[in-house]
Amino acid sequence: REAAPKSYAIRDSRQMVWVLSGNSLIAAPLSRSIKPVTLHLIACRDTEFSDKEKGNMVYLGIKGKDLCLFCAEIQGKPTLQLKEKNIMDLYVEKKAQKPFLFFHNKEGSTSVFQSVSYPGWFIATSTTSGQPIFLTKERGITNNTNFYLDSVE
């Protein structure tokens, strides 16, 4: 039986959720008037880049859209982007699609996502509402890199 991705709403400790704005992901306050994205998460079958200390390797997509999270270097800086891609197309590939891969690690009840292509760079939200979801190598006060994966199904 073919695996199916798991579905989650994603929220940070300031009760910000991920929202699709055009073809970008932004963080916005949890609110009835805002429709948070449902994140699709599925494990990568290829073990080429695996590192158990960093977590499980996963692909991340947006449910209901052929969009997946993707890391690329822009002007020398690792950047988080959305790329038109069906998450199951990534999953069925025999070879790991490195730019789309993230190490998913649990820290207490929270989840942390680290880029496989750019070790030490983590998915983050700013403390300011309406800002894009981005990659950072500075974990701490100004950036939030710990997320709650809320079951929505």
């Epitope: 609110s31 008037s33 009840s109």
Partner: antibody, heavy 122, light 111 residues
Framework: ELQLQESGPGLVKPSETLSLTCTVS??????????WGWIRQPPGKGLEWIGS???????YYEPSLKSRVTISVDTSKNQFSLKLSSVTAADTAVYYC??????????????WGQGTLVTVSS | ESVLTQPPSVSGAPGQRVTISCTGS?????????VHWYQQLPGTAPKLLIY???NRPSGVPDRFSGSKSGTSASLAITGLQAEDEADYYC???????????FGGGTKLTVL
Amino acid sequence: ELQLQESGPGLVKPSETLSLTCTVSGGSITASNYYWGWIRQPPGKGLEWIGSIDYTGSTYYEPSLKSRVTISVDTSKNQFSLKLSSVTAADTAVYYCATGSYYETYLGFDVWGQGTLVTVSS
Amino acid sequence: ESVLTQPPSVSGAPGQRVTISCTGSSSNIGAHYDVHWYQQLPGTAPKLLIYGNDNRPSGVPDRFSGSKSGTSASLAITGLQAEDEADYYCQSYDYSLSGYVFGGGTKLTVL
């Protein structure tokens, strides 16, 4: 239908620890996306949020009370509890437990217990 | 002092319309967190009256309505009735405090 019921001593001595329990019926305290809070109301005054715990076990406390407050969950009894240490007369209040769901009530509280009066006095 | 500011009291005659304001800041209402309203009848626990700025839970009469703009919100009650005499509280979330915040409450007197 979800229901909440507070219980605990009505009288606590100054400098001691106030301990209250909220029993949840009609639903599970581990249900996804729910948060459970404690709110108090001093006599003749307004509502004051004390702190919350959610289904992940994450706790959030009112900054001015943080050093004195502990909120925890007992899943086996379907209860959550409040401990407030080093109490003074200023902690005399009706204490309410309340709940909501992140994706249904959006950080509001839609179910409340009936409240229990705690008096701090020697 | 409460993080959200409400008038201490408002009053109106039966059948009239009254509004109760709730003023916050850029870290709560102004940051687009929802505002919720509670009614507390004398000697009873608060009851959710409006959630998500302008939504009524089932069983709440449509005489009650909520709205939000900028850093403020308001609760309107039309066709005022004697049984509406109660304390009303607004509530939101404040990201700078990482917590829930209440207004100081407004006592509604039906004349």
